[in-house]
């Protein structure tokens, strides 16, 4: 969370940004809020990126002004126009690229004053893992798969019964480069599992952490997965 203040004569407005992460190939949001102002025609929003000449996006007089937009962002940006009046200056970024990572500035001017705040935008790939029982193996095993990760993550297994146990000796993890030659498919197999136990497959890089849980009993298999972005908010 980054809060910036701006001074315009006697007036300053608070601008707040949130560090966030983009999943490459998907759409992302760079979050920025400011003190609301009902006078839409007096609101100017400018998004800038460190090291880039020209603007990422500009919104003024109630509409986009892309005359100074840098070509790397052409056709990829939009503000939430109906939300600007309530202080939402967040930027929607289409088809996030690895090169979109960096420091951005959200600059705001309203009839009340002006202000700005920076945000760090991280880019990478992250996806939910899916765990299945691998019945083809010679001994009962679990297969944890996640289709898209970058940078290369670490993978660890845990078990509810054997808490603190190190499963690295009884697991095998591989990373397979996807067709676009950036992201990788993660596959990890855990051998010698026992029934009536809950196992967790944890995949983590510097952007995200994902966990897949599986509980295998005689009668059923229960799965749960979750994903959280790191260093956000």
């Amino acid at each position: 969370l980054i809060i910036g203040f701006g001074i315009s004569g006697k007036h300053f407005i608070t601008v707040t940004t949130f560090t966030s992460a983009g999943n490459i190939g998907e759409d992302g949001t760079l979050s920025c809020t400011f003190e609301p102002d009902i006078k839409l025609n007096g609101i100017v929003i400018q998004w800038l990126k460190e090291g880039i000449k020209g603007l990422v996006h500009e919104f003024k007089e109630g509409k986009d002004d892309l005359s100074q937009q840098h070509e790397m962002f052409r056709g990829r940006t939009a503000v939430f126009a109906d939300q600007v009046v309530v202080g939402n200056a967040s930027l929607r970024l289409k088809n996030v690229q690895l090169t979109d990572a960096g420091t951005y500035t959200c600059y705001i001017r309203t009839s009340k004053g002006k202000g700005n705040a920076n945000l760090e935008y991280k880019t990478g790939a992250f996806s939910m893992p899916e765990i299945n029982v691998d019945y083809n193996a010679s001994s009962e095993s679990l297969r944890c798969e996640a289709p898209r990760w970058f940078p290369q993550p670490t993978v660890a297994w845990a078990s509810q019964v054997d808490q603190g146990a190190n499963f690295s000796e009884v697991s095998n993890t591989s990373f397979e480069l996807n067709s676009e030659n950036v992201t990788m498919k993660v596959v990890s197999v855990l051998y010698n599992v026992t029934i009536n136990n809950t196992y967790s497959c944890m995949i983590e890089n510097d952007i995200a952490k994902a966990t897949g849980d599986i509980k295998v009993t005689d009668s059923e298999v229960k799965r749960r997965s979750q994903l959280q972005l790191l260093n956000s908010g």
Partner: antibody, heavy 117, light 107 residues
Framework: QLQLQESGPGLVKPSETLSLTCTVS??????????WSWIRQPPGKGLEWIGS???????YYNPSLKSRVTISVDTSKNQFSLKLSSVTAADTAVYYC?????????WGQGTMVIVSS | DIQMTQSPSSLSASVGDRVTITCRAS??????LNWYQQKPGKAPKLLIY???SLQSGVPSRFSGSGSGTDFTLTISSLQPEDFATYYC?????????FGGGTKVEIK
């Protein structure tokens, strides 16, 4: 779902102050950023925006009514209020409260206020 | 203040007809134009916001277009429940102002 309900006297004497309250139910008035607004409609006529307030206390009034209007908010009661002073027969109207972003998406059902001695 | 002029002020149409209502702003309001439907004794109901975005729950026969100063509300196939008064409203510059309304009546 969010509902708005206007309340207040239906009859006000000329030169007195009209006071209305809008009670928000089904959600908190503070949960997000909205312009809590008042709009009126004289009998058989069109709609007129009176003004709006943010929970921060910032107010915005129609210049044609600004000298007579006060809008306030009470987050503890989940209510916002309208006061219109020095009323005349021209202030007779149905008064609506509404929630707004850059559009008025949730409205109360309206309350008729007649200004008469 | 920005003046909003609606036309026509009233029209008669039959069920199934395509109906078009126009709204003109006295200065550019970008796309900050909203459309409401009001039935007698009821509060207005939001139909279209941001000139062309359909409000959740509103039938797809309603559509909006335009930007700048000229805007249109279209009902592609008029239904019995659509007979009402329609208002445009700008939220670009306070005071927010409404058009005078268009009453859609049964022919």
């Amino acid at each position: 779902q969010l509902q708005l309900q206007e309340s207040g006297p239906g009859l006000v004497k000329p030169s007195e102050t009209l006071s209305l309250t809008c009670t928000v139910s089904g959600g908190s008035i503070s949960s997000s950023v909205y312009y809590w607004s008042w709009i009126r409609q004289p009998p058989g006529k069109g709609l007129e925006w009176i003004g709006s307030i943010l929970v921060s206390g910032s107010t915005y009034y129609n210049p044609s009514l600004k000298s007579r209007v006060t809008i306030s908010v009470d987050t503890s009661k989940n209510q916002f209020s309208l006061k219109l002073s020095s009323v005349t027969a021209a202030d007779t109207a149905v008064y609506y409260c509404a929630r707004a972003v850059s559009f008025l998406d949730v409205w109360g059902q309206g309350t008729m206020v007649i200004v008469s001695s | 203040d920005i003046q909003m002029t609606q036309s026509p002020s009233s029209l008669s149409a039959s069920v199934g007809d395509r109906v078009t209502i126009t709204c003109r702003a006295s200065q550019s309001i970008s796309s900050y134009l909203n459309w409401y439907q009001q039935k007698p004794g009821k509060a207005p109901k939001l139909l279209i916001y941001g000139a062309s975005s359909l409000q959740s729950g509103v039938p797809s026969r309603f559509s909006g277009s335009g930007s700048g100063t000229d805007f249109t509300l279209t009902i592609s196939s008029l239904q019995p429940e659509d007979f009402a008064t329609y208002y445009c409203q700008q939220s670009y510059d306070p005071p927010w102002t409404f058009g005078g309304g268009t009453k859609v009546e049964i022919k």
